[in-house]
Interface confidence: low
Protein backbone atom coordinates (compact mmCIF):
# COMPACT_ATOMS: atom_id res chain seq x y z
CA UNK A 1 0.00 0.00 0.00
CA UNK A 2 1.25 3.45 -0.88
CA UNK A 3 -0.27 6.21 1.23
CA UNK A 4 0.27 9.95 1.27
CA UNK A 5 -0.61 11.52 4.60
CA UNK A 6 -1.17 15.18 5.42
CA UNK A 7 -0.78 15.52 9.15
CA UNK A 8 -0.56 18.27 11.74
CA UNK A 9 1.97 16.29 13.76
CA UNK A 10 5.67 17.16 13.97
CA UNK A 11 8.35 15.05 12.31
CA UNK A 12 7.81 11.36 12.89
CA UNK A 13 11.16 9.96 11.86
CA UNK A 14 13.93 10.02 14.41
CA UNK A 15 16.37 8.12 12.24
CA UNK A 16 16.46 7.46 8.50
CA UNK A 17 18.00 4.63 6.54
CA UNK A 18 19.03 4.39 2.92
CA UNK A 19 19.51 0.62 3.06
CA UNK A 20 17.57 -1.19 0.33
CA UNK A 21 14.47 -3.09 1.43
CA UNK A 22 13.29 -5.75 -1.05
CA UNK A 23 9.73 -5.23 -2.23
CA UNK A 24 8.70 -8.66 -0.98
CA UNK A 25 9.35 -7.45 2.59
CA UNK A 26 7.25 -4.30 2.25
CA UNK A 27 3.61 -4.14 3.28
CA UNK A 28 2.94 -0.40 3.09
CA UNK A 29 4.67 2.86 2.29
CA UNK A 30 3.63 6.15 3.85
CA UNK A 31 4.71 9.50 2.45
CA UNK A 32 4.45 12.58 4.66
CA UNK A 33 5.00 15.76 2.65
CA UNK A 34 7.12 18.58 4.02
CA UNK A 35 5.27 21.09 6.18
CA UNK A 36 2.73 20.95 9.00
CA UNK A 37 5.42 21.17 11.64
CA UNK A 38 8.05 19.09 9.87
CA UNK A 39 10.59 20.79 7.60
CA UNK A 40 11.32 17.69 5.54
CA UNK A 41 9.53 15.05 3.52
CA UNK A 42 9.35 11.72 5.31
CA UNK A 43 8.98 8.22 3.86
CA UNK A 44 7.94 5.46 6.22
CA UNK A 45 8.12 1.82 5.17
CA UNK A 46 5.99 -0.68 7.07
CA UNK A 47 7.52 -4.13 6.67
CA UNK A 48 5.59 -7.37 6.63
CA UNK A 49 7.30 -8.47 9.84
CA UNK A 50 5.61 -5.47 11.51
CA UNK A 51 8.78 -3.42 11.92
CA UNK A 52 8.88 0.12 10.58
CA UNK A 53 11.76 1.88 8.87
CA UNK A 54 12.08 5.54 8.01
CA UNK A 55 13.74 5.72 4.63
CA UNK A 56 15.91 8.56 3.34
CA UNK A 57 13.80 10.23 0.61
CA UNK A 58 17.00 10.73 -1.38
CA UNK A 59 17.69 7.00 -1.58
CA UNK A 60 17.54 6.02 -5.25
CA UNK A 61 15.80 2.71 -4.64
CA UNK A 62 12.84 4.27 -2.83
CA UNK A 63 12.47 6.95 -5.48
CA UNK A 64 12.33 4.30 -8.20
CA UNK A 65 9.86 2.19 -6.23
CA UNK A 66 7.56 5.13 -5.53
CA UNK A 67 7.58 6.14 -9.18
CA UNK A 68 6.49 2.65 -10.19
CA UNK A 69 3.76 2.63 -7.56
CA UNK A 70 2.53 6.08 -8.56
CA UNK A 71 2.20 5.02 -12.17
CA UNK A 72 0.28 1.91 -11.19
CA UNK A 73 -1.99 3.83 -8.84
CA UNK A 74 -2.69 7.01 -10.74
CA UNK A 75 -5.12 5.42 -13.16
CA UNK A 76 -7.33 3.95 -10.42
CA UNK A 77 -7.02 5.96 -7.24
CA UNK A 78 -7.08 9.70 -6.48
CA UNK A 79 -4.29 11.64 -4.85
CA UNK A 80 -3.44 12.22 -2.03
CA UNK A 81 -4.23 8.77 -0.65
CA UNK A 82 -3.16 5.64 -2.49
CA UNK A 83 -4.09 2.26 -1.07
CA UNK A 84 -2.62 -0.50 -3.07
CA UNK A 85 -0.95 -3.71 -1.97
CA UNK A 86 2.62 -3.97 -3.11
CA UNK A 87 2.93 -7.14 -5.19
Amino acid sequence: VLEVYYTSLRCRCVQESSVFIPRRFIDRIQILPRGNGCPRKEIIVWKKNKSIVCVDPQAEWIQRMMEVLRKRSSSTLPVPVFKRKIP
Partner: antibody, heavy 123, light 111 residues
Amino acid sequence: EVQLQESGPGILQPSQTLNLTCSFSGFSLSTFGMGVGWIRQPSGKGLEWLAHIWWDDDRRYNPALKSRLTISKETSKNQVFLKIANVDTADTATYYCTRIAGYYGSRDWFAYWGQGTTVTVSS
Amino acid sequence: DIVLTQSPASLAVSLGQRATISCRASESVDNSGISFMHWYQQKPGQPPKLLIFRASDLESGIPARFSGSGSRTDFTLTVNPVETDDVATYFCQQSNKDPWTFGGGTKLEIK
Protein backbone atom coordinates in the same frame (compact mmCIF):
# COMPACT_ATOMS: atom_id res chain seq x y z
CA GLU B 1 -2.25 8.95 29.41
CA VAL B 2 -1.55 5.32 28.54
CA GLN B 3 -2.46 2.87 31.29
CA LEU B 4 -2.59 -0.93 31.38
CA GLN B 5 -3.93 -3.18 34.10
CA GLU B 6 -3.66 -6.94 34.34
CA SER B 7 -6.07 -9.25 36.12
CA GLY B 8 -5.92 -12.97 36.76
CA PRO B 9 -6.98 -15.73 39.14
CA GLY B 10 -4.12 -15.35 41.59
CA ILE B 11 -3.90 -19.06 42.39
CA LEU B 12 -4.72 -22.11 40.29
CA GLN B 13 -3.84 -25.78 40.19
CA PRO B 14 -1.62 -27.72 37.79
CA SER B 15 -3.29 -28.77 34.51
CA GLN B 16 -5.80 -25.92 34.70
CA THR B 17 -6.05 -23.10 32.16
CA LEU B 18 -4.79 -19.68 33.15
CA ASN B 19 -6.93 -16.79 31.91
CA LEU B 20 -5.41 -13.33 31.98
CA THR B 21 -7.03 -10.03 31.04
CA CYS B 22 -5.32 -6.77 30.14
CA SER B 23 -7.55 -3.70 30.34
CA PHE B 24 -6.05 -0.56 28.90
CA SER B 25 -6.79 3.09 28.26
CA GLY B 26 -5.15 5.98 26.48
CA PHE B 27 -4.96 4.26 23.10
CA SER B 28 -6.99 2.00 20.85
CA LEU B 29 -6.09 -1.32 19.30
CA SER B 30 -8.01 -0.24 16.23
CA THR B 31 -5.28 2.29 15.48
CA PHE B 32 -2.94 1.30 12.69
CA GLY B 33 0.33 0.08 14.16
CA MET B 34 -0.77 -0.62 17.72
CA GLY B 35 0.15 -3.79 19.55
CA VAL B 36 -0.31 -5.26 23.02
CA GLY B 37 1.76 -8.08 24.44
CA TRP B 38 2.38 -10.25 27.46
CA ILE B 39 5.63 -10.79 29.34
CA ARG B 40 6.18 -12.84 32.46
CA GLN B 41 8.78 -12.89 35.20
CA PRO B 42 9.23 -15.62 37.80
CA SER B 43 10.11 -14.18 41.19
CA GLY B 44 13.73 -13.02 41.28
CA LYS B 45 14.35 -14.12 37.70
CA GLY B 46 14.45 -12.72 34.18
CA LEU B 47 11.82 -11.60 31.70
CA GLU B 48 10.21 -13.85 29.10
CA TRP B 49 8.16 -12.59 26.17
CA LEU B 50 5.04 -14.72 25.68
CA ALA B 51 2.89 -13.27 22.90
CA HIS B 52 1.53 -10.12 21.34
CA ILE B 53 -1.34 -9.12 19.13
CA TRP B 54 -1.46 -6.32 16.57
CA TRP B 55 -4.25 -3.97 15.49
CA ASP B 56 -4.85 -6.15 12.41
CA ASP B 57 -5.30 -9.29 14.53
CA ASP B 58 -1.89 -10.64 13.60
CA ARG B 59 -0.73 -12.78 16.53
CA ARG B 60 2.83 -13.68 17.48
CA TYR B 61 3.79 -16.35 20.01
CA ASN B 62 6.92 -17.52 21.74
CA PRO B 63 7.63 -20.83 19.95
CA ALA B 64 8.65 -22.50 23.20
CA LEU B 65 5.12 -22.03 24.54
CA LYS B 66 3.05 -21.63 21.39
CA SER B 67 1.09 -24.87 21.76
CA ARG B 68 -0.26 -23.67 25.13
CA LEU B 69 -0.88 -20.00 24.37
CA THR B 70 -3.87 -18.19 22.90
CA ILE B 71 -3.95 -14.41 22.64
CA SER B 72 -7.05 -12.49 21.59
CA LYS B 73 -8.55 -9.02 21.81
CA GLU B 74 -11.83 -7.23 22.31
CA THR B 75 -11.07 -3.96 20.55
CA SER B 76 -14.29 -2.19 21.50
CA LYS B 77 -13.70 -2.93 25.19
CA ASN B 78 -9.99 -2.06 25.13
CA GLN B 79 -9.04 -5.50 26.36
CA VAL B 80 -6.52 -8.18 25.43
CA PHE B 81 -6.67 -11.74 26.74
CA LEU B 82 -4.09 -14.46 27.18
CA LYS B 83 -4.87 -18.10 27.86
CA ILE B 84 -2.21 -20.55 28.99
CA ALA B 85 -3.38 -24.14 28.90
CA ASN B 86 -2.23 -26.99 31.11
CA VAL B 87 -0.30 -24.88 33.59
CA ASP B 88 2.46 -26.22 35.78
CA THR B 89 4.34 -24.86 38.77
CA ALA B 90 6.92 -23.47 36.31
CA ASP B 91 4.23 -21.01 35.17
CA THR B 92 4.27 -19.32 38.57
CA ALA B 93 5.27 -15.73 37.81
CA THR B 94 4.25 -12.11 37.61
CA TYR B 95 2.52 -11.50 34.28
CA TYR B 96 2.85 -8.09 32.67
CA CYS B 97 0.74 -6.55 29.95
CA THR B 98 2.66 -4.16 27.69
CA ARG B 99 1.92 -1.78 24.88
CA ILE B 100 4.27 -1.96 21.96
CA ALA B 101 5.38 1.52 20.98
CA GLY B 102 3.50 3.10 18.10
CA TYR B 103 6.29 5.39 16.97
CA TYR B 104 7.75 5.59 13.52
CA GLY B 105 11.24 4.29 12.82
CA SER B 106 10.47 1.15 14.79
CA ARG B 107 7.71 0.19 17.15
CA ASP B 108 8.81 -2.96 18.81
CA TRP B 109 10.06 -2.02 22.21
CA PHE B 110 7.86 -2.14 25.29
CA ALA B 111 7.11 1.49 26.05
CA TYR B 112 4.31 1.01 28.57
CA TRP B 113 3.82 -1.67 31.22
CA GLY B 114 1.08 -2.60 33.62
CA GLN B 115 1.92 -3.19 37.27
CA GLY B 116 1.66 -6.94 36.77
CA THR B 117 -0.49 -9.65 38.25
CA THR B 118 0.99 -12.46 40.33
CA VAL B 119 -0.02 -15.99 39.41
CA THR B 120 0.78 -18.98 41.58
CA VAL B 121 0.36 -22.53 40.35
CA SER B 122 0.18 -24.89 43.29
CA SER B 123 -1.41 -28.21 44.11
CA ASP C 1 16.43 -17.84 19.16
CA ILE C 2 18.73 -14.89 19.67
CA VAL C 3 20.43 -15.30 23.04
CA LEU C 4 21.37 -12.13 24.89
CA THR C 5 24.20 -12.44 27.41
CA GLN C 6 24.58 -9.63 29.90
CA SER C 7 27.71 -8.96 31.88
CA PRO C 8 28.47 -8.58 34.63
CA ALA C 9 25.59 -10.25 36.46
CA SER C 10 26.05 -7.66 39.19
CA LEU C 11 28.26 -4.69 39.84
CA ALA C 12 28.87 -2.24 42.64
CA VAL C 13 29.80 1.33 41.73
CA SER C 14 30.61 4.31 43.90
CA LEU C 15 28.28 7.30 43.79
CA GLY C 16 29.28 9.66 41.04
CA GLN C 17 31.24 7.03 39.14
CA ARG C 18 30.49 5.36 35.82
CA ALA C 19 28.62 2.05 35.50
CA THR C 20 28.95 0.06 32.28
CA ILE C 21 26.74 -2.90 31.42
CA SER C 22 27.34 -5.10 28.39
CA CYS C 23 24.85 -7.06 26.32
CA ARG C 24 26.11 -9.47 23.68
CA ALA C 25 23.75 -11.07 21.14
CA SER C 26 24.30 -14.51 19.65
CA GLU C 27 23.65 -12.99 16.21
CA SER C 28 23.20 -9.53 14.75
CA VAL C 29 20.12 -7.58 15.83
CA ASP C 30 20.62 -4.94 13.12
CA ASN C 31 18.17 -4.54 10.25
CA SER C 32 17.89 -1.85 7.59
CA GLY C 33 20.48 0.26 9.38
CA ILE C 34 18.71 0.14 12.74
CA SER C 35 19.80 -1.78 15.85
CA PHE C 36 16.75 -3.39 17.42
CA MET C 37 18.19 -3.45 20.93
CA HIS C 38 16.49 -1.81 23.90
CA TRP C 39 17.29 -1.32 27.61
CA TYR C 40 15.03 -1.40 30.67
CA GLN C 41 15.42 -0.60 34.35
CA GLN C 42 13.53 -2.56 36.98
CA LYS C 43 13.31 -1.73 40.65
CA PRO C 44 12.04 -4.24 43.24
CA GLY C 45 8.27 -4.62 43.17
CA GLN C 46 7.90 -2.52 40.01
CA PRO C 47 7.50 -3.33 36.32
CA PRO C 48 10.44 -2.65 34.02
CA LYS C 49 10.79 0.88 32.65
CA LEU C 50 12.07 1.70 29.19
CA LEU C 51 15.37 3.63 29.24
CA ILE C 52 16.89 3.32 25.79
CA PHE C 53 15.37 2.17 22.51
CA ARG C 54 17.06 1.33 19.21
CA ALA C 55 20.43 0.97 20.97
CA SER C 56 21.03 4.65 21.64
CA ASP C 57 17.79 6.68 21.69
CA LEU C 58 16.93 8.02 25.13
CA GLU C 59 13.31 7.53 26.14
CA SER C 60 11.43 10.71 27.01
CA GLY C 61 11.82 11.66 30.68
CA ILE C 62 14.91 9.54 31.25
CA PRO C 63 17.93 11.47 32.61
CA ALA C 64 20.82 12.04 30.22
CA ARG C 65 23.04 10.17 32.68
CA PHE C 66 21.83 7.07 30.84
CA SER C 67 23.23 6.36 27.41
CA GLY C 68 23.38 3.42 25.06
CA SER C 69 25.74 2.45 22.29
CA GLY C 70 26.69 -0.44 20.04
CA SER C 71 25.58 -2.24 16.91
CA ARG C 72 25.15 -5.72 15.48
CA THR C 73 26.02 -8.02 18.39
CA ASP C 74 27.70 -5.84 21.02
CA PHE C 75 25.83 -3.22 23.04
CA THR C 76 26.54 -1.14 26.11
CA LEU C 77 24.42 0.71 28.63
CA THR C 78 26.30 3.41 30.52
CA VAL C 79 25.17 5.24 33.64
CA ASN C 80 27.36 8.25 34.38
CA PRO C 81 27.40 9.54 37.04
CA VAL C 82 25.66 6.88 39.11
CA GLU C 83 23.12 8.11 41.65
CA THR C 84 21.40 6.37 44.55
CA ASP C 85 18.17 6.16 42.57
CA ASP C 86 19.89 4.01 39.95
CA VAL C 87 20.01 0.94 42.18
CA ALA C 88 18.04 -1.57 40.11
CA THR C 89 18.30 -4.47 37.71
CA TYR C 90 18.89 -3.63 34.05
CA PHE C 91 17.74 -5.75 31.12
CA CYS C 92 18.51 -5.62 27.42
CA GLN C 93 15.96 -6.80 24.85
CA GLN C 94 16.12 -7.52 21.13
CA SER C 95 13.24 -7.31 18.70
CA ASN C 96 14.96 -8.02 15.41
CA LYS C 97 13.73 -11.61 15.28
CA ASP C 98 10.92 -13.60 16.82
CA PRO C 99 10.91 -14.63 19.56
CA TRP C 100 11.80 -11.32 21.13
CA THR C 101 14.27 -12.09 23.90
CA PHE C 102 15.72 -10.47 27.01
CA GLY C 103 19.11 -10.64 28.63
CA GLY C 104 19.41 -12.23 32.05
CA GLY C 105 19.76 -8.90 33.83
CA THR C 106 22.49 -6.95 35.59
CA LYS C 107 22.03 -5.84 39.18
CA LEU C 108 23.53 -2.41 39.92
CA GLU C 109 24.41 -1.60 43.52
CA ILE C 110 26.13 1.29 45.24
CA LYS C 111 29.56 0.57 46.68
